[in-house]
């Protein structure tokens, strides 16, 4: 029998590596069983996470799972950093891994790293 | 049921490159990360790297930097890993393990191939 | 990178007596979510490593309660109470905590 609590599945140490001026949608897969969760983004600020208060963010309901999404109209340059998604459910906090956006600004592009170069340069990819 | 399958045994020669697959049955590979860990004859394990299906964003130890490229195709629900400039350090049985939702904890693992480079 | 020593490298141990392997890494792998992704996996003769205990010491489905994991910060123990013929092999501890990924050297275990 499946678990009826709530879970966030982002995963861990996950990174996503994208560009200034683009649109991006920042997922947060959200499983639950009867009511959907009341759902929230924040951005990590050392050891605190600030909550994104007025940002666009929309559901997308597929058959398995939902998906509370985090919308970038556009990306900008100090979009870059952590970020994690909690539930309100019966009255518990349920936090998701966090999740990295590497944004390369758009006056760079032309000197835009690959996923590999990202790969191979760690004072990019370990901040 | 959950599983792994990888490719058969390669027998290559130095200089040489090499596409190793692997492709999952019972679970989506976007739903996971799948790292690739290599085991030379002498029992020792090291990490290659791993890739995130669903983004593509890839992660290597830098020891397989410009060695190792992984890549993954979420159609065909397979992982491969390309080796390139082959030598005889190369020789190996490389696994595929895949976390389920990203856990890092290496929940499944498949047979292995092996990898012989000989001239 | 995070430096994984595994002792001892062959432990000879007689059915119904107990075992530990000792590993010991070189930077705390308490992670920044409060779990510790110290893991122990088993390779039996002529097959894959299997998981057998992560995040310090959650039993693997279907491992025997015979085998705990225990541990903090840079210094881990598996323990098996009582050896049986199936636990031969070689056991690896890894941690996961910090890129790059890193194994212990392994330690094989023998009846005697």
């Known amino acids: 029998k499946e678990s009826c609590d709530v879970q966030l599945y982002i995963k861990r140490q996950s990174e996503h590596s994208i560009l200034a001026g683009d649109p991006f949608e920042l997922e947060c897969p959200v499983k639950y069983c009867a009511n959907r969760p009341h759902v929230t983004w924040c951005k990590l600020n050392g050891t605190t996470c600030v909550k994104l208060e007025d940002r666009q963010t929309s559901w997308k309901e597929e058959k398995n799972i939902s998906f509370f999404i985090l919308h970038f109209e556009p990306v900008l340059p100090n979009d870059n950093g952590s970020y994690r998604c909690s539930a309100n459910f019966q009255s518990n906090l349920i936090e998701s891994h966090s999740t990295t956006l590497y944004v390369t600004d758009v006056k760079s592009a032309s000197e835009r790293p690959s996923k590999d170069e990202m790969a191979s340069r760690p004072w990019l990819l370990y901040r | 049921e959950v599983q792994l399958q990888q490719s058969g045994a390669e027998l290559v020669k130095p200089g040489a490159s090499v596409n190793l697959s692997c492709t999952a049955s019972g679970f989506a590979i976007r739903d996971t990360y799948l790292h690739w860990v290599k085991q030379r004859p002498e029992q020792v394990l090291e990490w290659t790297g791993r890739?995130?299906?669903?983004?593509?964003?890839?992660k290597y130890d830098p020891r397989f930097q410009g060695k190792a490229t992984l890549t993954a195709d979420t159609s065909s629900n397979t992982a491969y890993l390309h080796l390139s400039s082959l030598t005889s350090e190369d020789t190996a049985v490389y696994y595929c393990?895949?976390?389920?939702?990203?856990?890092?904890?290496?929940?499944?693992w498949g047979q292995g191939t092996t990898l012989t480079v000989s001239s | 990178d995070v430096v994984m020593t595994q002792t001892p490298l062959t432990l000879s141990v007689t059915i119904g007596q107990p075992a530990s392997i000792s590993c010991k890494s070189s930077?705390?792998?308490?992670?920044?979510?409060?779990?510790?992704?110290l893991n122990w996996l088993l390779q039996r003769p002529g097959q894959s490593p299997k998981r057998l205990i992560y995040v310090l010491s959650k039993l693997e489905s279907g491992v025997p309660d015979r085998f705990t994991g225990v541990g903090s910060g840079t210094d881990f123990t598996l323990k098996i109470s009582r050896v049986e013929a199936v636990d031969l092999g070689v056991y690896y501890c890894?941690?996961?905590?910090?890129?790059?990924?890193?194994f212990g050297g392994g330690t094989k275990l023998e009846i005697k």
């Open positions: 393990v895949a976390d389920y939702y990203g856990s890092s904890l290496f929940d499944y």
């Open positions: 930077q705390s792998l308490l992670d920044s979510d409060g779990k510790t992704y």
């Open positions: 890739i995130d299906p669903a983004n593509g964003n890839t």
């Open positions: 890894w941690q996961g905590t910090h890129f790059p990924y890193t």
